[in-house]
């Protein structure tokens, strides 16, 4: 696992950053775990970063992710509606200069090094559930969420609204 101290060092610097001229509403350093309390961890392998979903040993420290929250206009999907809505989007960065990206072609979630402004693939619409879990919907592909598949993060198409609460797209954010 990597990036814990690195993230904390650059949290302050990110406060001054802007993405296409928009500053984040807030930033939050948190560990990310699944609905079933498995941890999301990040490891350097063969010069690229891998993302794992795993049970941590008792005293093993959780990796932290910097979530940056942005406000965006919510495009109404019904003609004639008043376009009054806003949505919250987040970017997720486990270490300096690296962000989670949606690879819609491969249905995968990847860590990419990139400069500002970040591409749309790095933005996820945040949903919070009655269970106080959250889910992350791809900005570039509405109806597709970050989820867990075979101990990895993957992009999962939520076919019907009834499946919005399906456990494999629910995550917990924790400061500890």
């Amino acid at each position: 696992a990597f990036g814990i101290s690195g993230v904390q060092k650059y949290t302050r610097a990110l406060h001054d950053s802007s993405i296409t001229g928009i500053s984040p509403i807030t930033e939050y350093l948190a560990s990310l775990s699944t609905y079933n309390d498995q941890s999301i961890t990040f490891a350097l392998e063969d010069e690229s970063y891998e993302i794992y979903v795993e049970d941590l040993k008792k005293d093993e420290k959780k990796d932290k992710v910097l979530l940056s929250y942005y406000e965006s206009q919510h495009p109404s999907n019904e003609s004639g509606d008043g376009v009054d809505g806003k949505m919250l989007m987040v970017t997720l960065s486990p270490t300096k200069d690296f962000w989670l990206h949606a690879n819609n072609k491969e249905h995968s979630v990847e860590l990419h090094k990139c400069e500002k402004p970040l591409p749309d693939q790095a933005f996820f619409v945040l949903h919070n559930m009655h269970s106080n879990c959250v889910s992350f919907e791809c900005k570039t592909d509405p109806g597709v969420f970050i989820g867990v598949k075979d101990n990895h993060l993957a992009l999962i198409k939520v076919d019907s609204s009834e499946n919005l609460c399906t456990e494999n797209i629910l995550f917990k954010l924790s400061e500890t």
């Epitope: 509403i25 807030t26 919510h74 509606d81 009054d84 806003k86 919250l88 919070n128 559930m129 106080n132």
Partner: antibody, heavy 122, light 107 residues
């Protein structure tokens, strides 16, 4: 223009039930949770719970878990609150309210209905 | 549940005064706090969301600040139409909870 229009005032006897409606217009009904909040005379605001119109997933505040039922009718973009086993302390104005953010409660309630006064008296 | 505690519960002030209302959350809610104004017989109106963001159409004399557990609503120069009751509300986690309200009265 977004509007939440509630049904009219009700007078009920203790032990009866009441059903309050909230008709939404001006936005995509299924995109935002519908919340219900009540306010007893001279008192503060108290959350009853909310419903996600996409999948009818509900959350009830502990105080209302046994007596409140939240439902929706997607065909008419209407949300309903039914409160059973009414007692005098349920006398209050009941409001429906829509979240500010799509998919999230974090931004509070931006649109409110005009309120429905429910009076419980024998 | 997250408890929201507002203070004071009421205050008397004059037109032109600077008024400050505080709200304390029993646990960290980041910036996910909203402020509402309510006048007698009317529904609440959103003033501030995300702790400091002014809702559309709200006069700039209203401002909000804070994060974590402690938040403030400030009215820089009280106007006659500002005499009302003000509520804070956390949106971070269910159940969503309100402060008990602060009534701003004419001195």
């Amino acid at each position: 223009e977004v509007q939440l229009v509630q049904s009219g005032a009700e007078v009920k006897k203790p032990g009866a039930s009441v059903k309050v409606s909230c008709k939404a217009s001006g936005y995509t009904f299924s995109d935002y949770n519908m919340n219900w909040v009540r306010q007893a005379p001279g008192q503060g605001l108290e959350s009853i719970g909310d419903i996600n119109p996409k999948n009818a997933d509900t959350f009830y505040n502990q105080n209302f878990k046994d007596r409140a039922t939240l439902t929706i009718d997607k065909s008419t973009s209407t949300a309903y609150l039914e409160l059973s086993s009414l007692r005098s302390e349920d006398t209050a104005v009941y409001y429906c309210a829509r979240h500010y953010y799509y998919g999230s409660s974090y931004g509070g309630f931006v649109y409110w209905g005009q309120g429905t006064l429910v009076t419980v008296s024998s | 549940d997250i408890q929201m505690t507002q203070s004071p519960s009421s205050l008397s002030a004059s037109v032109g005064d600077r008024v400050t209302i505080t709200c304390h959350a029993s646990q960290n809610i980041n910036v996910w706090l909203s402020w509402y104004q309510q006048k007698p017989g009317k529904n609440p109106k959103l003033l501030i969301y995300a702790a400091s963001k002014l809702h559309t159409g709200v006069p700039s004399r209203f401002s909000g600040s804070g994060s974590g557990t402690d938040f403030t609503l400030t009215i820089s120069s009280l106007q006659p139409e500002d005499f009302a009751t003000y509520y804070c509300q956390q949106g971070q986690s269910y159940p969503l909870t309100f402060g008990q309200g602060t009534k701003v009265e004419i001195k």
